[in-house]
Interface confidence: low
C-alpha cells in the first residue's frame, strides 16, 4: 500500500533530488498543525504568524486582535493564557525546562480593560505552574513547591500550603516519577468546573532514594543533580489529595480526600482526578501492584465541610491477565446526570472498548465492540459521544473519529472522518469547542497533514485551518521514499510492519535493511502518519530499506498481544523483531549480510538484546539511551509490567533480562552505544553498566556520550548524534561517504 502523495514520473524525474541529512537536521520539511484555543462554543484564539493573539468568531466570521505582538514582545512572551472572564491575559516568558513536561517561567498579567500590565502584588519568579480558574479570573500558582491563590490578579496571594520543600514535599506539582510515569503533566492541581474548589496533590518524597549525577557546565567543579527517583522495588512517594474552598480558603482550610480502604491497605498510587460538578469529584487510585484500580466518586458535605467517598460509589477495575488499563488506566467521561460515566476498558474478548457505567462496573453497558480498540473519548454531549478508534478497514495504525448518537435508541454510529480525504488522511485527532458546537480535525497523515474546522451538528467542513501548502510545494522536487503498511501472520501472532523503501525500489535488487525499534509495552510504531525524518533520508539518499515492526506487547490490537510481555520484558519483543527480519529476508530483496537494528530508550534495550541474541542476523546496531536492567528504571513504569524485584515475586526475570548478562554475545556484532550524561529518565548508569560488562568480557564496541544532555539529546547534540549514527551505518553497510 503506497501511502505517499503520488508524483510526476520520468520526464521530471531528473529535476528531482533525494533528501539530504541537512534537510532533516534543519527541519526543512516539518509540518504545521492548527489546534484552536477554544474559549466558547463558537470562538477560539490563535497566535498568528506575526505573533498577534487573534480571537475568531466562527458564527460572525469576525476576528480581532486581543493582544498585540508588541505587548507579547515587551516581556518576551512565548505563551499566553486568557482568563475566562476575558479581563486578563497571563504572559509566559523565561521558559526554563525541567523534566519532560515541567518547566518554570516568569508570568506577567496584562489587564485587557485598561491595556496595562497589572502592577502591585506581582507574581514571584520563577513559577512552577500557573492557571486561571475555569470561571472569572482567580489564579492558582505553584511557587517553591507551595500553592498560592489570588482572587484577582492584582490581589495579594493567599498561601494554601506551607510545607513545600525542594525534593521533599511537592504541592500542586508532581515529583519526578508521578510526572513521567503516572500523571504525564506538569501540574497536580485541578479546579472544580465553576472554580469554587481547588483540588491538589501533595507528594511526600522524604524517604525516596535519590539519583545523583554530575552536571559539568562551565564551572571549575561540576554540579551534582539530585532527584528523588524510586527505582523498581524502592520506597515510593506518599501521595495525599486535598480540596480547598477557594472562595473562603481559610474557613476550614484544605480538606483531605479519603483513600478507599481496599487501596490504602498497602502501597498505592493516585492516578487521576476528574471533577464532575463543583461538589462532586472522582478520584482514581491504583495498587502498587498495578492490576487493581479503584475509581472513587466523592461528594462535598456542606454541613461538615468535608468530602465523603461512599463505598457504594467505588468502582473496581481489575486485570487478571496483565496490568490495569493500557499504558495508563483510562479516565472517566461523565454524562449530564453527573453520576454515570463512559470509560474505556477491556471487554470479555480482551479488546479495549467504551463502556457506560450507571451503577456498578459489573452492570456496565458495552457501547463499542469488535476486534479493534476504542482509543480515546473526546467529548460527551446530551446527544452524542465522540471517540477515536482503529476500526476502519482493520488497520490498527489508523485513527478515525466516530460519533455515536446516545440521545436516540438504538444508538447509531457514524464515522466522521473515514471518507473525508481517504488517501491523504487516515490518522486523526480532534479538538472540540464547548458543547461540541464546532470541532477541529487534525489529520497527521499518511499524506501531508491538514487541519480543518467542522460544524458539530452536521459534521460539515467549514474551512481549512492549515493545509501545509508550502510544505507540499517544497516536496514537489524531492524523491521521497515509498511506504508500505502490511502484516505478517506468524504462529497465530499478527505482526504489523511499516516498510520504507528507496524511491527507485526494485524488488529484484538487494538492499541493506535497518530495523527501527521501540517495542515498549502499549506503544505503537506502525502508524499511518506523515514524517520526513532521518529514516526517510536513509531510504531516499542512502538506498536503505527501513522497517518498523509492532510485536507482542504493543498496543491497540487486543489484550492477548498487549499482555503477552507481562512479567517477561525483553523476551517476546526481541523474538518478534527477529521473526520479522527472517520474514523480510524471505521476501528476496534484503541483503542478509547487511542488516542493522537501532532504537532509543526502550528501543535501545530491545536493539541491544536483539544484537546479543546470538542469531547472527545483525551485522551491527545502535542503542541510544538504553535501559540495561529493569532494576535501574522507575518503579511506577517497571513494576507495572514486571512486578517487584524480590525473591518471592519476579527477581529472577529482572536478573535474566539485563543487557549485561549477554555481554559475551556482542563479540560478533558492531555495537554503538550512546547516552547523555545528564539523563534524568534512563540514567547514564544503564550504559555505564553495559560498557563495564563489555570491557570485563573484553568485547570491542563503540560508544559516544553527550555531556550534560538528557534523554532527548536535543540541540546541537541532535545534529552530532544523527551525523555520527549515519557514518556508523554507512560504514557497517559499506556505503561510500
Amino acid at each position: 500500500i503506497v501511502l505517499r502523495p503520488s508524483r510526476v514520473h520520468n520526464s521530471e524525474e531528473n529535476t528531482m533530488r533525494a533528501l539530504t541529512l541537512k534537510d532533516i537536521l534543519n527541519g526543512t520539511f516539518s509540518y504545521k498543525t492548527f489546534f484552536p484555543n477554544w474559549i466558547s462554543g463558537q470562538e477560539y484564539l490563535h497566535q498568528s504568524a506575526d505573533n498577534n493573539i487573534v480571537l475568531y468568531n466562527i458564527e460572525t466570521g469576525q476576528s480581532y486582535t486581543i493582544l498585540s505582538n508588541r505587548t507579547m514582545k515587551s516581556v518576551n512572551a512565548s505563551n499566553y493564557g486568557l482568563s475566562p472572564d476575558r479581563q486578563f491575559v497571563y504572559l509566559e516568558s523565561d521558559y526554563s525546562k525541567l523534566w519532560r513536561y515541567s518547566y518554570t517561567a516568569t508570568y506577567y498579567i496584562y489587564d485587557l480593560s485598561n491595556g496595562e500590565f497589572v502592577r502591585g502584588n506581582e507574581l514571584p519568579r520563577p513559577i512552577q505552574y500557573l492557571c486561571w480558574s475555569p470561571v472569572g479570573s482567580k489564579l492558582a500558582y505553584v511557587y517553591q513547591n507551595n500553592i498560592y491563590l489570588k482572587q484577582r490578579p492584582g490581589d495579594p496571594p493567599f498561601q494554601i500550603t506551607f510545607n513545600g520543600r525542594e525534593n521533599k514535599i511537592f504541592n500542586g506539582i508532581p515529583d519526578w516519577v508521578y510526572e513521567e510515569e503516572m500523571l504525564a503533566t506538569k501540574y497536580a492541581l485541578w479546579w472544580s468546573p465553576n472554580g469554587k474548589f481547588l483540588a491538589y496533590a501533595e507528594f511526600n518524597d522524604t524517604d525516596i532514594p535519590v539519583i545523583a549525577y554530575s552536571y559539568y557546565g562551565d564551572e571549575q567543579y561540576p554540579r551534582t543533580i539530585n532527584i528523588p527517583y524510586p527505582k523498581a522495588g524502592a520506597k515510593n512517594p506518599v501521595v495525599r489529595i486535598f480540596i480547598i474552598d477557594t472562595t473562603y480558603p481559610a474557613y476550614v482550610g484544605p480538606q483531605e480526600v479519603p483513600v478507599p480502604a481496599m487501596i490504602a491497605s498497602s502501597d498505592y498510587y493516585f492516578s487521576w482526578l476528574t471533577w464532575v460538578t463543583d461538589e462532586r469529584v472522582c478520584l482514581q487510585w491504583l495498587k502498587r501492584v498495578q492490576n487493581v484500580s479503584v475509581l472513587s466518586i466523592c461528594d462535598f458535605r456542606e454541613d461538615w465541610q468535608t468530602w465523603d467517598c461512599p463505598k457504594t460509589q467505588e468502582h473496581i477495575e481489575e486485570s487478571r491477565t496483565g496490568w490495569a488499563g493500557g499504558f495508563f488506566v483510562s479516565t472517566p467521561v461523565f454524562s449530564y446526570d453527573a453520576i454515570s460515566y463512559y470509560k474505556i476498558f477491556s471487554d470479555k474478548d480482551g479488546y479495549k472498548h467504551i463502556h457506560y457505567i450507571k451503577d456498578t462496573v459489573e452492570n456496565a453497558i458495552q457501547i463499542t465492540s469488535g476486534k479493534w480498540e476504542a482509543i480515546n473519548i473526546f467529548r460527551v454531549t446530551q446527544d452524542s459521544l465522540f471517540y477515536s478508534s482503529n476500526e476502519f478497514e482493520e488497520y490498527p495504525g489508523r485513527r478515525n473519529i466516530y460519533r455515536i448518537s446516545i440521545g436516540s435508541y438504538p444508538p447509531s454510529k457514524k464515522c466522521v472522518t473515514c471518507h473525508l480525504r481517504k488517501e491523504r488522511c487516515q490518522y486523526y485527532t480532534a479538538s472540540f469547542s464547548d458543547y461540541a458546537k464546532y470541532y477541529a480535525l487534525v489529520c497527521y497523515g499518511p499524506g501531508i497533514p491538514i487541519s480543518t474546522l467542522h460544524d458539530g451538528r452536521t459534521d460539515q467542513e467549514i474551512k481549512i485551518l492549515e493545509e501545509n501548502k508550502e510544505l507540499e510545494n517544497a516536496l514537489k522536487n524531492i524523491q521521497l521514499p515509498k511506504e508500505e503498511i502490511k502484516k505478517l501472520e506468524v504462529d497465530e501472532i499478527t505482526l504489523w510492519y511499516k516498510m520504507i523503501l528507496p524511491p527507485q525500489f526494485d524488488r529484484s535488487k538487494k538492499y541493506p535493511l535497518l530495523i527501527q525499534v521501540y517495542g515498549g509495552p502499549c506503544s505503537q510504531s506502525v502508524r499511518s502518519v506523515f514524517a520526513v525524518n532521518w529514516i526517510s533520508y536513509l531510504a531516499s539518499k542512502e538506498g536503505m530499506v527501513i522497517a518498523l515492526v509492532d510485536g507482542r506487547g504493543t498496543a491497540f490490537q487486543g489484550d492477548k498481544l498487549l499482555y503477552a510481555v507481562y512479567r517477561k520484558l525483553g523476551v517476546y519483543e526481541v523474538e518478534d523483531q527477529i521473526t520479522a527480519v527472517r520474514k523480510f529476508i524471505e521476501m528476496g530483496f534484503i541483503d542478509e549480510k547487511r542488516i542493522a537494528i537501532w532504537g532509543w530508550s526502550y528501543g535501545g534495550y530491545v536493539s541491544s538484546l536483539a544484537l546479543a541474541s546470538g542469531t547472527g542476523l545483525f551485522k551491527c546496531g545502535i542503542a541510544v539511551a538504553p535501559v540495561s536492567s529493569w532494576e535501574y528504571y522507575a518503579s511506577v513504569y517497571t513494576e507495572r509490567f514486571m512486578g517487584l524485584p524480590t525473591k518471592d515475586d519476579n527477581l529472577e526475570h529482572y536478573k535474566n533480562s539485563t543487557v549485561m548478562a549477554r555481554a559475551e554475545y556482542f563479540r560478533n556484532v558492531d555495537y554503538l552505544l550512546i547516552h547523555g550524561t545528564a539523563d534524568d529518565n534512563v540514567h547514564f548508569q544503564n550504559s555505564a553498566q553495559i560498557a563495564k560488562a563489555l570491557v570485563n568480557a573484553q568485547v570491542d564496541f563503540q560508544a559516544m556520550w553527550y555531556s550534560d544532555q538528557n534523554h532527548g539529546l536535543s540541540g546541537l547534540s541532535t545534529n552530532h548524534l544523527y551525523t555520527h549514527m549515519t557514518h556508523f551505518l554507512k560504514q557497517c553497510f559499506s556505503l561510500s561517504d
Epitope: 472569572g136 482572587q151 484577582r152 492584582g154 490581589d155 495579594p156 493567599f158 498561601q159 506551607f162 472562595t247 473562603y248 480558603p249 481559610a250 474557613y251 482550610g253
Partner: antibody, heavy 117, light 108 residues
Framework: DVQLVESGGGLVQPGGSLRLSCAAS????????MTWVRQAPGEGLEWVSG???????YYADSVKGRFTVSRDNSKNTLYLQMNSLRAEDTAIYYC???????????WGLGTLVTVSS | EIVLTQSPGTLSLSPGERATLSCRAS??????LAWYQQKPGQAPRLLIF???NRATGIPDRFSGSGSGTEFTLTISSLEPEDFAVYYC??????????FGGGTKVEIK
C-alpha cells in the same frame, strides 16, 4: 490601586439612625467579603459586621438587630445602616476588604460616628 | 468566642532594639492569626497573615511565628516609624472575628 473611602459619619442622638458608605476602587467589591470594624476613642479594634461575596451577612452580637450591612455592586459601594444608636456605638468606623473570609488586607481611613445627646 | 490576650500592654524600647510581642488565644486556632500595625490618626495596616507570612510591602524586619495558642510578632531592629500600636486578630472561629487588646510600642 485598592482604595476605600468611608463617609456618612457625624453626630447623632441616641436612638437615631445613620447610614455609612464605603466607596471602593481598584477592585470589584462583588468578588470579596467586606467588613466593618470600629474603634471607640482610645480603645482597641472591634469587628462589627461583614458581608460575603455571596451576599451572606454577619453581625457582632452587640449590633445584631440594629445594624444592617449591604452593598451595591454597580456602584462598588458598601453600606452600614445603623438604627437605634447608643452612646457605646461612638467610634471611628472603618470599612475593610477581607481576604477570603480571614484577615483584612485593605482599610479605609475611617469615619467618626458620635452618639450623644 | 475566642479571646485573644496581648502582652505586654506597653513596650518601651529604643530604635535599633528588638521587639517581641505576644498574643495568646483562649483555644487553639491553628495558624489562623493576623497582625496589624496602627499609628495615631491612621487606619490599621496588615503586617502578617497565617501567623508567619508577611503581607505585600512589609519589610523583613517584621516576622511572625507560632501556632495553636501562642503567637509572637518580632521586630528585629526597631526603626523610628515602627513605634505604633500592634493588634493580633484570629479568623479561625467566626463570627465574630476577634482582636487582641493591642500592644503599644513606644520610644523609651
Amino acid at each position: 490601586d485598592v482604595q476605600l473611602v468611608e463617609s456618612g459619619g457625624g453626630l447623632v442622638q441616641p436612638g437615631g439612625s445613620l447610614r455609612l458608605s464605603c466607596a471602593a476602587s481598584g477592585f470589584s467589591m462583588s468578588n470579596f467579603a467586606m467588613t466593618w470594624v470600629r474603634q471607640a476613642p482610645g480603645e482597641g479594634l472591634e469587628w462589627v459586621s461583614g458581608i460575603r461575596g455571596s451576599g451572606t451577612t454577619y453581625y457582632a452580637d452587640s449590633v445584631k438587630g440594629r445594624f444592617t450591612v449591604s452593598r451595591d455592586n454597580s456602584k462598588n459601594t458598601l453600606y452600614l445602616q445603623m438604627n437605634s444608636l447608643r452612646a457605646e456605638d461612638t467610634a471611628i468606623y472603618y470599612c475593610a476588604k477581607t481576604w477570603g473570609t480571614e484577615y483584612f488586607d485593605y482599610w479605609g481611613l475611617g469615619t467618626l460616628v458620635t452618639v450623644s445627646s | 468566642e475566642i479571646v485573644l490576650t496581648q502582652s505586654p500592654g506597653t513596650l518601651s524600647l529604643s530604635p535599633g532594639e528588638r521587639a517581641t510581642l505576644s498574643c495568646r488565644a483562649s483555644q487553639p486556632i491553628n495558624n489562623y492569626l493576623a497582625w496589624y500595625q496602627q499609628k495615631p490618626g491612621q487606619a490599621p495596616r496588615l503586617l502578617i497573615f497565617s501567623a508567619s507570612n508577611r503581607a505585600t510591602g512589609i519589610p523583613d524586619r517584621f516576622s511572625g511565628s507560632g501556632s495553636g495558642t501562642e503567637f509572637t510578632l518580632t521586630i528585629s531592629s526597631l526603626e523610628p516609624e515602627d513605634f505604633a500600636v500592634y493588634y493580633c486578630q484570629q479568623y479561625y472561629d467566626w463570627p465574630p472575628y476577634t482582636f487582641g487588646g493591642g500592644t503599644k510600642v513606644e520610644i523609651k
